[in-house]
């Protein structure tokens, strides 16, 4: 069971990143699915290595002073959402913005029907060029 | 099937990084090989988690003004090369240069004879000290 | 065999990071254990994918001029410690400090009783907020 999906620009104002089965994507079988273009949902309980990579372009003057943060989050059936992993990068002084990449990854127990998704502080700063922003998992 | 190889400084002007089976490297068996010191080639079709880490030292005045980009690329038999993953970092203002690290990783389907390699915008900026720059894969 | 542990602030002056089985941690069975809150120790020989993520907050005026370095290290029974992976980031100019994240990961052969741990140049700069700093492994 494995998946690797590709970032998709979105006009939605939500902080949850959007993904698509496009380009060189992976969706091994129907035991993992991409739902609503925003979350990877698994049908089998078990340990999964889950990862995300986000490239973004920001500038410290144009942004709020808070850093850019990417969060890998979990929603299990009947449970509250919870943060699994986060990473942060301070904004660049490049103009109009400077590129930076964040990588997240870890091993987590997922229940049947559990979904994982990626949140960022400012989706408008995310880079959607080939290979720069992606999200996936693999069952151990 | 798994491999982990270590970066090697090269006098070649190519943007493709060079690797070696040295230090604490991994080469599980002959179903994955390091070819010409530049690419990991697999004999078996399947899903692989492929990763690379590149540490580099750059300065925005001494460098071209473009960001440092690392790309994980795929060459399948009879196919064009394609980019699997990329990451970028804007240059530092540290003198003579500032260290930064990039990590790439994802799950991809590889065909028999497929090769993966790592490209960077400026190989002369790559840090080859112990543990800083490496490349590997594992079959799921 | 898999583990994922969460960073813990420590009053110790050691450069070795401290970890805990808290929050959304993973400890699959007793074939991997967290020892003294500082190292993951495995009982079975084999290939492991080992990873660490460290988020830190530093400022180039307040810090030494040397970059922040995170190292993934190995101690095998009867052997000297050795560095498996390292990553570096130059300090930010943000005030009072700028957040940055480092991710390390690779495939390594571990012997029975081998331990892996994470070293940083300045533990006081590490960010221990939910999800920012973690450490884990999985057996292939």
């Amino acid at each position: 069971i494995a998946a690797h999906v590709i970032s998709e620009a979105s006009s939605k104002t939500t902080s949850v990143l959007q993904w698509a089965e496009k380009g060189y994507y992976t969706m091994s079988n129907n035991l993992v699915t991409l739902e609503n273009g925003k979350q990877l949902t698994v049908k089998r309980q078990g340990l999964y290595y889950i990862y995300a990579q986000v490239t973004f372009c920001s500038n410290r003057e144009a942004s709020s002073q808070a850093p850019f943060i990417a969060s890998l989050c979990l929603k299990s059936p009947g449970r509250f959402e919870r943060i699994l992993l986060r990473a942060a990068n301070t904004h660049s002084s490049a103009k109009p913005c400077g590129q930076q990449s964040i990588h997240l990854g870890g091993v987590f127990e997922l229940q049947p029907g559990a979904s994982v998704f990626v949140n960022v502080t400012d989706p408008s700063q995310v880079s959607h060029g080939t290979g720069f922003t992606s999200f996936g998992l693999l069952k151990l | 099937i798994a491999a982990h190889v270590i970066s090697e400084a090269s006098s070649k002007t190519t943007s493709v990084l060079q690797w070696a089976e040295k230090g604490y490297y991994t080469m599980s068996n002959n179903l994955v090989t390091l070819e010409n010191g530049k690419q990991l080639t697999v004999k078996r079709q399947g899903l692989y988690y492929i990763y690379a880490q590149v540490t580099f030292c750059s300065n925005r005045e001494a460098s071209s003004q473009a960001p440092f980009i690392a790309s994980l690329c795929l060459k399948s038999p009879g196919r064009f090369e394609r980019i699997l993953l990329r990451a970028a970092n804007t240059h530092s203002s540290a003198k003579p240069c500032g260290q930064q690290s990039i990590h790439l990783g994802g799950v991809f389907e590889l065909q028999p004879g497929a090769s993966v390699f790592v490209n960077v915008t400026d190989p002369s900026q790559v840090s080859h000290g112990t543990g800083f720059t490496s490349f590997g894969l594992l079959k799921l | 065999i898999a583990a994922h542990v969460i960073s813990e602030a420590s009053s110790k002056t050691t450069s070795v990071l401290q970890w805990a089985e808290k929050g959304y941690y993973t400890m699959s069975n007793n074939l991997v254990t967290l020892e003294n809150g500082k190292q993951l120790t495995v009982k079975r020989q084999g290939l492991y994918y080992i990873y660490a993520q460290v988020t830190f907050c530093s400022n180039r005026e307040a810090s030494s001029q040397a970059p922040f370095i995170a190292s993934l290290c190995l101690k095998s029974p009867g052997r000297f410690e050795r560095i498996l992976l390292r990553a570096a980031n130059t300090h930010s100019s943000a005030k009072p400090c700028g957040q940055q994240s480092i991710h390390l990961g690779g495939v390594f052969e571990l012997q029975p009783g081998a331990s892996v741990f994470v070293n940083v140049t300045d533990p006081s700069q590490v960010s221990h907020g939910t999800g920012f700093t973690s450490f884990g492994l999985l057996k292939l």
Epitope: E61, P96, Q99, S127 | Q65, A66, H91 | -
Partner: antibody
Framework: QVQLVQSGAEVKKPGSSVKVSCKAS????????ISWVRQAPGQGLEWMGW????????NYAQKFQGRVTITADESTSTAYMELSSLRSEDTAVYYC???????????WGQGTLVTVSS | DIQMTQSPSSLSASVGDRVTITCRAS??????LNWYQQKPGKAPKLLIY???SLQSGVPSRFSGSGSGTDFTLTISSLQPEDFATYYC?????????FGQGTKVEIK
């Protein structure tokens, strides 16, 4: 040597759209930003927007927001600027230029004259 | 938007003269100020970036100074090929904006 070569002059009717191309050669086009700047006859320079070609990030001047779209094709090293709902005051020479770290524009295309007239 | 005001809007000078053009920003732009030269029918050419860095290939008679809100372009000894229009541009904040230009003419 970096060269930016733009598409030819256009004559357009009010209310229509124009799409100007800018093809780069001789350098790493895709790693840099591309800005679009226009200059009305006898007037000064006006910045319209920016794209980072391989990354896909864009920034637009508020004045043109909703009317201008800047895109890029990494495979052909070409950037595009499309301006819609044209009016007579959009008559100008449109330049593409490569932008670097500090927001300076170091290489410029030769310019494309767009005339909007009924 | 940040307003960029150049002065003078035009000047007459002779070959060998020292020429100074000033550019004032309506708010602080740190050192994110660039200078361009434009000749009739041609695209602008970058002279100075980041307030005082000389662009490669540009003669050393051109220099830039200033930070914050007040900036200066100096041509130490005017040459015949320097008769043109000069623009300053701020790249600190979106939208990037240009000064209205200073035309340097032959006296």
């Amino acid at each position: 040597q970096v060269q930016l070569v733009q598409s030819g002059a256009e004559v357009k009717k009010p209310g229509s759209s124009v799409k100007v191309s800018c093809k780069a050669s001789g350098g790493t086009f895709s790693s840099y930003g591309i800005s679009w700047v226009r200059q009305a006859p006898g007037q000064g320079l006006e910045w319209m927007g920016w794209i980072s070609p391989i990354f896909g990030n864009t920034n637009y001047a508020q004045k043109f927001q909703g009317r201008v779209t800047i895109t890029a094709d990494e495979s052909t090293s070409t950037a595009y600027m499309e301006l819609s709902s044209l009016r007579s005051e959009d008559t100008a020479v449109y330049y593409c230029a490569r932008s670097r770290y500090y927001g300076d524009l170091d290489y410029w295309g030769q310019g494309t004259l767009v005339t909007v007239s009924s | 938007d940040i307003q960029m005001t150049q002065s003078p809007s035009s000047l007459s000078a002779s070959v060998g003269d020292r020429v100074t053009i000033t550019c004032r920003a309506s708010q602080s732009i740190s050192s994110y100020l660039n200078w361009y030269q434009q000749k009739p029918g041609k695209a602008p050419k970058l002279l100075i970036y980041y307030a005082n860095s000389l662009q490669s290939g540009v003669p050393s008679r051109f220099s830039g100074s200033g930070s914050g809100t007040d900036f200066t372009l100096t041509i130490s000894s005017l040459q015949p090929e320097d008769f043109a229009t000069y623009y300053c541009q701020q790249s600190d904040s979106i939208p990037w904006t240009f000064g209205q230009g200073t035309k340097v003419e032959i006296k």
